[in-house]
Amino acid sequence: QKSSIEKCSVDIQQSRNKTTERPGLLNCPIYWQQLREKCLLFSHTVNPWNNSLADCSTKESSLLLIRDKDELIHTQNLIRDKAILFWIGLNFSLSEKNWKWINGSFLNSNDLEIRGDAKENSCISISQTSVYSEYCSTEIRWICQKELTPVRNKVYPDS
Amino acid sequence: QKSSIEKCSVDIQQSRNKTTERPGLLNCPIYWQQLREKCLLFSHTVNPWNNSLADCSTKESSLLLIRDKDELIHTQNLIRDKAILFWIGLNFSLSEKNWKWINGSFLNSNDLEIRGDAKENSCISISQTSVYSEYCSTEIRWICQKELTPVRNKVYPDS
C-alpha cells in the first residue's frame, strides 16, 4: 500500500511527462517568508555582493529580483530596521554602462530611484526606505528569493 | 472534483507541515541531465565565472559542487568534446589563500588535481579529462546543478 506522498510522486511524474512542468515550491521552506508568488530569505550575516550571490545559489535560489515599484515597497515593508542594508540581484555592468539584473535584463529606469553613483564595482542594496548604490565589496546582509508557484512548461535556456 | 495533482498539493503541503521538508525535485527538469542525486545543466553559451554563477542562481540552482574524485569522473564522462571547458563553483579566495567552493567550504587538496596557478582572480573549470585554473574573466561554458532528492528537515542557515 503506497502512502499518499508516494502516490503523489507517481501522479506528478506522469503529469510532468505530459507538460514538462517541474514541481516547483508548493509553499515556502522553513525560515523563508512568503511575499506573493515568492519565498524570501533575509540573511542575518553579512557578505560582499559576490558572496551573497553565491550563498543564494547554493541555496538553489537567486538574489532578489524586483519587478516593479510595487514589489519593492512590499519587500521594504518586511525590513524592520531603517538603517540595515540588503543586497539584491542588481549591479552595474561596466561594458554596457547600465544597471543589470543577474537574470541578464536591464533596469527600467522608472522602477527604482537609486541613490548613489552608477559606476564600476557598484551593486544595489535596499533599506526600509531607499535603494542605494554601494561598493560591491561592502559587507552587508542580502535577500534570496525562490519562485513559489510551479510554472507550466518552464524551461531553462541559457541566459 | 479535484485532479490528482490538486489533491497532491494538499497531501504534500500537509506532509510538509509535519516534517518541514520542502518538496524538492522529484525528477529533473527538461534539458537537465540526471547524475545520481543531482540534475546537471551544461550550458551551450559562454560566460565569465561571475555571470555563470548568476545564471545558475537565476535558474534556482548552483554552479556545480563536486564532492569527490568519483563525482568528478562521472561528471567528466558526460562531457562530449575533449577541448571544451566548463566553470564549476570553485574559485580562489585571496583573503584565505585557498580554493573555496561557493558554499563556503574549502577544497580538500586530494579531491581535484588542479592544473594552473592558485592566485587572485582564478576560477576552476573542468574538461573531459582535467581540472584547470583559469582567469575568472575567461568566457567558457558552465555547469549548473540542482539537488534531486528532497531532504527531510532541510533548512537554510546563512553561510
Epitope: V46, A83, I84, L85, S137, E139 | S95
Partner: antibody
C-alpha cells in the same frame, strides 16, 4: 557582557611606534565593521580607520595614511592599530568602536571602548 | 571632504527645558547622520542613527530630524543626566566619517 577593551597606549617619542589592541566580547565580532576613533585632549572626535568584517576592506583618514595599519583577528575577537612614525599631533585618547551591523560602510558607532591614551612627546 | 557645522557651540539650559541643536552638512548626505552624547572622561554614546532612528535604550525625549544638509537633535525635556557634549557625525559610504565640532549643554 557586550564590551570593547583597549590596551597598548602610553608615552612614546616622536618617530616612535605603538601597537594598540582592542578585545571584543559578548557579540559576534566577525560580523561587524570595526573602527578606531581618536580625541585629542579637549578637542572633538576624529575617525581614524575602519576594517570590514572579513578584513578585506580597509580605509584610513588622510592624517594617518601610510603611517597607521589597522588589522583584526576574528578567531581572537581582536582589533589592532599599528602606529608608526608617530607625531605630537597624534596625541589623543584612542577609542575602539563597533559599527551598527549591516549598515555597511555607513559607520554608526553603537559600541565604544573606554579608550587608551597615547602621548607623543620628547 | 564633507564638513559638519554644529550650532550653537554651547547652550545654557535648565532642567525641563526644550533644547534644539542643529547640524549642517557642506553637501547633501541624505539621511546618513548620527548623533552622540559624550560626558567628561567617558566614551561617546550613540543616540540617533539614520537621522531620526532612536538607538535602543535611549530615552524617547531625544529625537532627530532632517535630511539632505540640515539636521536637528531635540531634547524635549532636559534631565540632569543630559548635561553633556553632543556631536553629529556624517556616515555617507565614503570616508572620512567627519564629526561636527560639538555642542556643550550646560546648566543655566
Amino acid at each position: 557582557q557586550v564590551q570593547l577593551v583597549e590596551s597598548g597606549g602610553g608615552l612614546v617619542k616622536p618617530g616612535g611606534s605603538l601597537r594598540l589592541s582592542c578585545a571584543a566580547s559578548g557579540f559576534t565580532f566577525s560580523q561587524y565593521y570595526m573602527s578606531w576613533i581618536r580625541q585629542a585632549p579637549g578637542k572633538g572626535l576624529e575617525w581614524v580607520s575602519y576594517i570590514s568584517p572579513s578584513g578585506a576592506t580597509i580605509a584610513y583618514a588622510d592624517s594617518v595614511k601610510g603611517r597607521f595599519t589597522i588589522s583584526r583577528d576574528n578567531a581572537k575577537n581582536s582589533l589592532y592599530l599599528q602606529m608608526n612614525s608617530l607625531r605630537a599631533e597624534d596625541t589623543a585618547v584612542y577609542y575602539c568602536a563597533r559599527s551598527l551591523m549591516a549598515t555597511g560602510t555607513h559607520l554608526y558607532f553603537d559600541l565604544w571602548g573606554r579608550g587608551t591614551l597615547v602621548t607623543v612627546s620628547s | 571632504d564633507i564638513q559638519l557645522t554644529q550650532s550653537p557651540s554651547s547652550v545654557s539650559a535648565s532642567v525641563g527645558d526644550r533644547v534644539t541643536i542643529t547640524c549642517r552638512a557642506s553637501q547633501g548626505i541624505s539621511s546618513w547622520l548620527a548623533w552622540y552624547q559624550q560626558k567628561p572622561g567617558k566614551a561617546p554614546k550613540l543616540l540617533i542613527y539614520a537621522a531620526e532612528s532612536l538607538q535602543s535604550g535611549v530615552p524617547s525625549r531625544f529625537s532627530g530630524s532632517g535630511s539632505g544638509t540640515d539636521f536637528t537633535l531635540t531634547i524635549s525635556s532636559l534631565q540632569p543626566e543630559d548635561f553633556a557634549t553632543y556631536y553629529c557625525q556624517q556616515v555617507t559610504s565614503q570616508p572620512p566619517y567627519t564629526f561636527g565640532g560639538g555642542t556643550k549643554v550646560e546648566i543655566k
